[in-house]
């Protein structure tokens, strides 16, 4: 068991051009904070995967503003250490993320706002026990420096805090066959309550008679090194000769996830992935709780009223991720229905509605014709969100409100004259031609092309289209 | 402006299960999620529980094994369940909407007064 | 759950007078993700106060409120007749989300 410790010495701009705005201003008072992930390994792993060595946050640091026209500064930090405790062994190498919050303290709708200013990530050695390790990470215009190291939590000791010291039982030396704890000289190695044989170096044990193998050994002692090359059970290697397991019981067999975490096997031993909340290489740390304020952006903790119990966030519309810290464009989801025009407004959504439609969300096809009367006795014909009007003979416009000129379309063919009437239009035809609209002509020997002409009408004669 | 409206039966009998409906208008019910929260005669306030459109929901542990909370996206409507009523159960029954800025309550209908009785 | 104790019960003052209703939390609230509401009788509350500080929409500016972590305060800087009504707490940061016990303003 040990203390994981994050010392932040400075944020703020990094060298060279491109000198980034300052996250505060006069209008905007802001303050940092940090949070950092673990993981054991050197794994390549996305963010938002889980911080199995354990994670921590800040305090909140100083407010700052601004001063207007000063370049950005580095900016005010919280006081204090970072500290991840980790319970089992410390892995030797393993993965961070260290993450710079800005915390907005304007007048924020519904408290204050967060966002992430700067994600830095690596992936190290490093022994317990040993120096503070100094480092400078760059997240674009943005520069950190800290420090970190990894101590073990009496009795433990050692690179991996696997061994256990106990005070001296005598003044002058340690008991037979026990050495001093460097660097605690007033301290004795304490005697060993592993399974006999269990390698000193490789493997370790909290309860007596046990021995669990740190990363890379395997073997009922811890001595056997891992090597998956010539292995052709699933199981992974084992045997001191050829450095292969027969087959036996998997290292997930009874789950040693706690807290509901699932147990997949790897290579070297197992890998336990835990439920939101919880952290360690077996899912035993809950790092955070809901008492440590984790959900941003007016999200609601759930859960997690202590550290056995993982909390999840109840995200507000317009954010999302596990601790409400992404926002969201609602507008790209396509809300608006029959293409309405959205706006986010923050407080809301509003969707701006084509003609014929209407609701929060324009989801209501108008009747078009509701209440739009087609005067002079046209018809109101609905489509597409709009109304018209099928108008009487004589009449048109938008509403058959306007009087229509029948000859104005020159419906009378052949030269014929067109005449306006109360009941439509006539047309006079020009000598040969016939009909309705003067369209047949006469043929030369009288008998005219159907139709004939009424009884009583000559070809020449204005016929009236009824 | 979001208006909520309360409806459901004013007597329930003791055992059995108080059913309220609530219906949006003025805006999306896919844009809030929606609360149920009642007051007993002369008394202070009790959250009852939420739910989103999308179906998530969170309850108040005290009434937790007996609430049931759901949502119709069609008919702009939520609903209420509480199963094994009793004399206690007795309140007005407000539903509103949560604020987007935060889980308070912005818009509340006026209130349905249930009564449980035999 | 997080416990909201309002005090005083019942608050006894007369128009134009100042007011300050108190809101003490069993544990800290985080963000400060407190509201504020009013309720008449016969009415269902109304939001005040949320974000322990910020008005809401149309709330007139005698209403102010303050405070962090486990201690708030709503104030009412002159009272108005249409002021006396009971005023409760609600924390919004945890759940289940709670509200206090409500204070009584009255006419003196």
């Known amino acids: 068991a040990g203390v994981f410790e994050l010392q932040i010495h400075s944020f703020g701009p990094g060298p060279g051009p491109g000198a980034p705005r300052s996250p505060c201003s006069a209008r905007l008072p802001c303050r940092l904070f940090f949070r950092v992930c673990l993981k054991p390994g050197l794994s390549e792993e996305a963010a938002e995967s889980p911080c199995a060595l354990g994670a921590a946050l800040s305090a909140r640091g100083p407010v700052y503003t601004e001063q207007p026209g000063a370049p950005a500064p580095d900016l005010p930090l919280p006081d204090g250490l970072l500290q991840v405790p980790f319970r089992d062994a410390w892995p030797g190498t393993f993965s961070f993320i260290i993450e710079t919050w800005r915390e907005e303290l304007g007048d924020q709708i519904g408290g204050p706002a967060w966002s992430l200013l700067a994600r830095v990530a690596g992936r190290r050695r490093l022994a317990a026990g040993g120096p503070w390790a100094r480092d400078i990470q760059r997240a674009g215009a943005w520069e950190l420096r800290f420090s970190y190291r990894a101590r073990c939590e009496p009795p433990a000791v050692g690179t991996a805090c696997t061994r256990l010291c106990r005070p001296r039982s005598a003044p002058s030396r340690c008991g037979p066959g026990l050495r001093p704890c460097a660097p605690l000289e007033d301290e004795c190695e304490a005697p060993l309550v592993c399974r006999a044989g269990c390698s000193p170096e490789h493997g370790f044990c909290e309860q007596p008679g046990e021995c669990r193998c740190l990363e890379g050994w395997t073997g009922p002692l811890c001595t056997v090194p891992v090597s998956t090359s010539s292995c052709l059970s699933p199981r992974g290697p084992s045997s001191a000769t050829t450095g292969c397991l027969v087959p036996g019981p998997g290292p997930c067999d009874g789950n040693p996830c706690a807290n509901g975490g699932s147990c997949s096997e790897t290579p070297r031993s197992f890998e336990c992935t835990c439920p939101r909340g919880f952290y360690g290489l077996r899912c035993e740390v809950s790092g955070v709780t809901c008492a440590d304020g984790p959900c941003f952006n007016g999200g609601l903790c759930v859960g997690g009223a202590d550290p056995d119990s993982a909390y999840i966030c109840h995200c507000p519309p317009g954010f999302q991720g596990s601790n409400c810290e992404k926002r969201v464009d609602r507008c790209s989801l396509q809300p608006c229905r029959n293409g309405g025009l959205c706006l986010d407004l923050g407080h809301a959504l509003r969707c701006r509605c084509r003609a014929g439609f209407a609701g929060p969300r324009c989801e209501h096809d108008l009747d078009d014709c509701a209440g739009r009367a087609c005067a002079n006795g046209g018809t109101c014909v609905e489509g597409g969100g709009a109304h018209r009007c099928s108008c009487a003979l004589g009449f048109g416009g938008r509403d058959c409100r306007e009087r229509a000129d029948p000859c104005a379309a020159r419906p009378c063919a052949h030269g014929g004259r067109c005449y306006a009437h109360f009941s439509g239009l006539v047309c006079a035809c020009a000598p040969g031609y016939m009909g309705a609209r003067c369209e047949f002509p006469v043929h030369p020997d009288g008998a005219s092309a159907l139709p004939a002409a009424p009884p009583g009408l000559r070809p020449g004669d204005p016929q009236r289209y009824l | 402006q979001v208006q909520l409206q309360e409806s459901g039966p004013g007597l329930v009998k003791p055992s059995e299960t108080l059913s309220l409906t609530c219906t949006v208008s003025?805006?999306?019910?896919?844009?809030?999620?929606w609360t149920w929260i009642r007051q007993p005669p002369g008394k202070g306030l009790e959250w009852i529980g939420y739910?989103?459109?999308?179906?998530?929901?969170n309850y108040n542990p005290s009434l937790k094994s007996r609430v049931t909370i759901s949502v119709d996206t069609s008919k702009s409507q939520f609903s209420l369940k509480l199963s094994s009523v009793t004399a206690a159960d007795t309140a007005v029954y407000y539903c509103?909407?949560?604020?987007?800025?935060?889980?308070?309550?912005?818009?509340w209908g006026q209130g349905t007064l249930v009564t449980v009785s035999s | 759950e997080i416990v909201l104790t309002q005090s005083p019960g019942t608050l006894s003052l007369s128009p134009g007078e100042r007011a300050t209703l108190s809101c003490r939390a069993s544990q800290s609230v985080s963000s400060s993700y407190l509201a504020w509401y009013q309720q008449k009788p016969g009415q269902a509350p109304r939001l005040l106060i949320y974000g322990a500080s910020t008005r809401a929409t149309g709330i007139p500016d005698r209403f102010s409120g303050s405070g962090s972590g486990t201690d708030f305060t709503l104030t009412i800087s002159r009272l108005e007749p249409e002021d006396f009504a009971v005023y409760y707490c609600q924390q919004y940061g945890t759940s289940p989300l709670t509200f206090g016990g409500g204070t009584k303003v009255e006419i003196k």
């Open positions: 003025g805006d999306s019910i896919s844009s809030y999620y």
């Open positions: 509103a909407s949560i604020a987007v800025r935060g889980f308070f309550f912005d818009y």
């Open positions: 739910i989103y459109y999308s179906g998530t929901t």
